[in-house]
């Protein structure tokens, strides 16, 4: 089903992982496909097997080395190919010359923790994971807080336009359960996108002291 609309999209996590998604309408679910990476200035090639994630899309991770190793730089170009088995041979289904640092998507922030909580405010910190030292401080964050009776989609986005791995949430309601998420994006890269949202951190504000005006 070559005539079905197809798309191939990959992102580099800035260290040692290129994650790819291949979608093709009308393709058979049991089709065996893989992504092959061929850098222009490295001695290694890498392949990963595309595994189904939905009716018409497949995904895989090209693991280039240890998670925190810097396997690619801003000058690298990686030729990526989608290969699908047809009978006894492999057929090229998509090709792309991929500039890793133009196509960044970092790992979700980790280690979220409540530093300090009061009745109306909460200080939360987090860490970035597997982010290149090349960025120095050129990162930005978005955060959102889930309030009772609302959805994540309704939560207003808080933007941190600098590498600030903490936030002080204010004007919270006492004795109330909240959840918090954060995501990160480098400033570099024409096709760079936000990381996935972090795992939600649940916290509860302190109850108002009895007899005190709140």
């Amino acid at each position: 089903a070559v005539n079905g609309t197809s798309q191939f999209t990959c992102f580099y996590n800035s260290r040692a992982n290129i994650s790819c998604v291949w979608s093709q309408d009308g393709a058979l679910q049991d089709t065996s496909c893989q992504v092959h990476a061929w850098p222009d200035r490295r001695r290694w090639n890498q392949t990963c097997e595309l595994l189904p994630v939905s009716q018409a899309s497949w995904a895989c991770n090209l693991i280039l080395g240890a998670p925190d190793s810097q396997k690619l730089t801003t000058v690298d170009i990686v030729t990526l190919r989608v290969l699908c088995r047809e009978g006894v041979r492999w057929r090229v289904m998509a090709i792309q010359d991929f500039k890793p640092f133009e196509n960044l998507r970092l790992m979700a922030p980790i280690s979220l923790q409540v530093v300090h909580v009061e009745t109306h405010r909460c200080n939360i910190s987090w860490e970035i994971s597997q982010a290149s030292h090349y960025f120095e401080r050129h990162l930005e964050f978005e955060a959102r807080t889930l309030s009772p009776g609302h959805t994540w989609e309704e939560a207003p986005l808080l933007t941190l336009k600098q590498k600030q791995e903490w936030i002080c949430l204010e004007t919270l309601t006492p004795d109330t359960q909240y959840e918090f998420q954060v995501r990160v994006k480098p400033l570099q890269g024409e096709f760079t996108t936000w990381s996935p949202w972090s795992q939600p951190l649940a916290f509860r504000t302190k109850p108002a002291a009895l007899g005190k005006d709140t």
Partner: nanobody, 125 residues
Framework: EVQLVESGGGLVQAGGSLRLSCAAS????????MGWFRQAPGKEREFVAA????????MYAESVEGRFTISRENAKNMVYLQMNSLKPEDTAIYYC??????????????????WGQGTQVTVSS
Amino acid sequence: EVQLVESGGGLVQAGGSLRLSCAASGRTFSTTEMGWFRQAPGKEREFVAAITWTGRGTMYAESVEGRFTISRENAKNMVYLQMNSLKPEDTAIYYCAAARRGRAAVRSEGGYDFWGQGTQVTVSS
């Protein structure tokens, strides 16, 4: 925005050769994946070949593999399709296509945003 103009089509005998050219205008050409498609009378437009922006990656339709070669010259904003051992079934209008910058070259028309007007290739037996 990329504008594409094809040339080099014509009438050729079976077994002969033609070289199609695609002239591109637009500053983003040198980092854009390119492809050739064709449409025979009464048939749908079909994929022929594609090339990545550095020229390191190429792919071909099964029907033309080993006979056609896609190449490009970024300094001149040109893409070429060298067609050898032509067959009557290669008769079609040949279109040059450009993917949006940052997107992969694929075998489906939907992967390409910019198209030329086409050049006619007729192979007589």
